[in-house]
């Protein structure tokens, strides 16, 4: 009799475990659905608001010609700055012309004043050659003014109206860049 009760108890316990598993799976599935829903809603809202405002740049970004720029409010090292930009679908600022440099430095003066801002420029440790993050070379007029005395990896930053260089592991603000959305009108 006792053995029978014990067997029934074990069967009930097994059933309970299976139900808990099923509930856990359901909760996970529900969470996943909610997450997907949140994404869909966010995308719809983003699409609707950009269609309504036909804004080429996201909120808190600055537009100049075909580019949108974001000036960070936090400090980070060069590599983390790049990752922060990537999360927003952008990369660190890549300055292609003197006109773009003038726009950036002019905007920074208005926003924050004379601080250091990482850009997507770094120096090859062996050759000492400067390269933008996409592998292209900076134009001669857009090379950092001073060579950093650091034995570590060296990266480029903007300060006032100059391009300078520093150890990539120092903390600075940073500027992200992405392409502005073209208006379909």
């Amino acid at each position: 009799k006792l053995l029978q009760v014990s067997t029934i108890a074990m069967q009930q316990q097994e059933k309970l475990i299976q139900q808990e598993r099923a509930l856990l799976n359901f909760t996970e599935w529900k969470r996943s659905c909610a997450l997907q829903m949140k994404y869909c809603q966010a995308f719809m809202q983003n699409s609707l608001s950009s269609a309504h405002n036909s804004s080429p740049c996201p909120n808190n970004w600055i537009q100049n010609r075909e580019s949108c720029y974001y000036v960070s409010e936090i400090w980070s090292i060069w590599h983390t700055s790049q990752e922060n930009c990537l999360k927003e679908g952008s990369t660190l600022l890549q300055i292609e012309s003197k006109e773009e440099m003038d726009f950036i430095t002019g905007s920074l003066r208005k926003i924050k004043g004379s601080y250091d801002y990482w850009v997507g420029l770094s120096q090859d440790g062996h050759s000492g050659r400067w390269l933008w993050q996409d592998g292209s070379s900076p134009s001669p007029g857009l090379l950092p003014a001073e060579r950093s005395q650091s034995a570590n990896q060296v990266c480029g930053y903007v300060k006032s109206n100059s391009l300078l260089s520093s150890n990539c592991s120092t903390w600075k603000y940073f500027i992200c860049e992405k392409y502005a959305l073209r208006s379909s009108v």
């Epitope: 949140k38 994404y39 999360k87 952008s90 996409d134 992405k178």
Partner: nanobody, 121 residues
Framework: QVQLQESGGGLVQSGGSLRLSCAAS????????WGWYRQAPGKQRELVAA???????AYAPSVNGRFTISRDSAKNTVYLQMNSLKPEDTAVYYC???????????????WGQGTQVTVSS
């Protein structure tokens, strides 16, 4: 959710080449940027190369000029062409997908299982 599967790793001589592939499935529409990271034994995981959904590209200074990242949107695949490989490139290479930030949600990055790349001298 987004699932990532890497392939193409292996053993190669110094100066040689390898091409890594990362096949993505799931909610790929939610991704802002695709990337490759690597982790050598006893070191932190580091960004190697990334490509945004706009096609903007970023390389780590250590691989700039040697590695090339590309993406085939139709196949939902990201590639990393690695040339002039050095022993210091030896690491496990991970595919990464960064989702669009959604207000009120803390969704982290998506990661593949990793593929081993060994460069012998």
């Amino acid at each position: 959710q987004v699932q990532l599967q890497e392939s193409g790793g292996g053993l190669v001589q110094s100066g040689g080449s390898l091409r890594l592939s990362c096949a993505a499935s799931g909610s790929v529409f939610s991704i802002n940027a695709w990337g490759w990271y690597r982790q050598a034994p006893g070191k932190q995981r580091e960004l190697v190369a990334a490509i945004t959904n706009q096609g903007r590209i970023a390389y780590a200074p250590s691989v700039n000029g040697r590695f090339t990242i590309s993406r085939d949107s139709a196949k939902n695949t990201v590639y990393l062409q690695m040339n002039s490989l050095k022993p210091e490139d030896t690491a496990v290479y991970y595919c990464n997908a960064k989702p669009t930030p959604v207000y009120g949600s803390t969704v982290g990055d998506y990661w593949g299982q990793g593929t081993q790349v060994t460069v012998s001298s």
